[in-house]
């Protein structure tokens, strides 16, 4: 015997004990799939959450985080405080990155600078709390007699003295 409740569309619920009529979800509730026996209460975006998409009888509300916070977890289940670039969030709040580490985002942890020497390269630009180091050519590439990464200077035309 086919379950008549399976005919009930999203936005309705079916009470099997009654006439198997699909009744509309009550206010502030939804069913996003058909054949539901109950409707779910809409998510409320309060406090550090703000509404990105209103709830409807067929779909739940979607939340974002208010300014100064960012989403964590599936469907923005949590809001975490933003820090500045060059900082990370600890139990005691935002703390500057330790020397040798950086964070170029408002979220996440401080990560160690790249160790250029592991790739046989040298440090071209020093790292900061906000930026990773920039690795350049290896020290061997910069030694006398080695081919340079810079192109040779153009040859002077004959008969012209240097300016």
């Amino acid at each position: 015997l086919q379950d008549l409740c399976s005919n009930c569309p999203a936005g309705t619920f079916c009470d099997n004990n009654r006439s198997q009529i699909c009744s509309p979800c009550p206010p502030n509730s939804f069913s996003s799939a058909g054949g539901q026996r109950t409707c779910d209460i809409c998510r409320q975006c309060k406090g550090v959450f703000k509404t990105r998409k209103e709830c409807s009888s067929t779909s739940n509300a979607e939340c974002d985080c208010i300014s100064g916070y960012h989403c964590l977890g599936a469907e923005c289940s949590m809001c975490e405080q933003d820090c500045k670039q060059g900082q990370e969030l600890t139990k005691k709040g935002c703390k500057d990155c330790c020397f040798g580490t950086f964070n170029d985002q408002k979220r996440g942890i401080c990560r160690p600078w790249t160790n250029c020497s592991l790739d046989g390269k040298s440090v071209l630009v020093n790292g900061t709390k906000e930026r990773d180091v920039v690795c350049g050519p290896s020290p061997a590439d910069l030694s006398p007699g080695a081919s340079s990464a810079t192109p040779p200077a153009p040859a002077r035309e004959p008969g012209h003295s240097p300016q």
Epitope: C8, G11, I21, S23, N28, S56, S57, S59
Partner: antibody, heavy 114, light 106 residues
């Protein structure tokens, strides 16, 4: 701001037909079921018809079954009520209502009389 | 069909008075909604699923009940509360409204 604006009411002869419309704005119309509810002069409220968000489920009050047809055009955010074989007892203010019953239109008056 | 009977049909109350409107159903319903209709305007949702206040509704309104008996209470009546009040159920088809209670302010 959520708005429901009904139109199409007026004076109709008994046995005649009329089509009411309800223009919705300010919310995701295609995500909500919709009702028509009516109120006869100096009387209470009476549920008339319901249509689910995707039009797959439709119900009518016994008093209008076989004479009224509810439909919707989601791309145009519009709800309709086609009424035929009208009787004097269909005289009422007709409201379009979101399925949560939290928003009602201002209503359109239908008078069935000779 | 489930018939909803509201009582009293007309009620007169003084400002500041606490009043209770009742709605009884001929069969058990899962929950009840209440709407308010002021003269010449559309109805407005007041209480949903028995006891939840709709958006923007003052906290002096409250709802309770279960099964076949539900009530709406106004803890301290104000002049702006003069209106018709309807209970309605949307769980058992056909969906029905009560006959209404007219609240007059003395």
């Amino acid at each position: 701001d959520v708005q429901l604006v009904e139109s199409g009411g007026g004076l109709v002869q008994p046995g005649g037909s009329r089509k009411l419309s309800c223009a919705a704005s300010g919310f995701s119309f295609s995500s909500f079921g919709m009702h028509w509810v009516r109120q006869a002069p100096e009387k209470g409220l009476e549920w008339v018809a319901y249509i689910s968000s995707g039009s797959s489920t439709i119900y009518y009050a016994d008093t209008v079954k076989g004479r009224f047809t509810i439909s919707r055009d989601n791309p145009k955010n519009t709800l309709f009520l086609q009424m035929t074989s009208l009787r004097s007892e269909d005289t009422a203010m007709y409201y379009c209502v979101r399925d949560w019953t939290d928003y009602w239109g201002q209503g359109t008056t239908l008078t069935v009389s000779t | 069909q489930i018939v909803l009977t509201q009582s009293p049909a007309i009620m007169s109350a003084s400002l500041g008075e606490e009043i209770t409107l009742t709605c009884s159903a001929t069969s058990s319903v899962s929950y009840m909604h209440w709407s308010q209709q002021k003269s010449g305007t559309s109805p407005k949702l007041l209480i949903y699923t028995t006891s939840n206040l709709a958006s923007g509704v003052p906290s002096r309104f409250s709802g309770s009940g279960s099964g076949t008996f539900y009530s709406l209470t106004i803890s301290s009546v104000e002049a702006e509360d003069a209106a018709d009040y309807y209970c309605h159920q949307w769980t058992t088809y056909p969906w029905t409204f009560g006959g209404g209670t007219k609240l007059e302010i003395k």
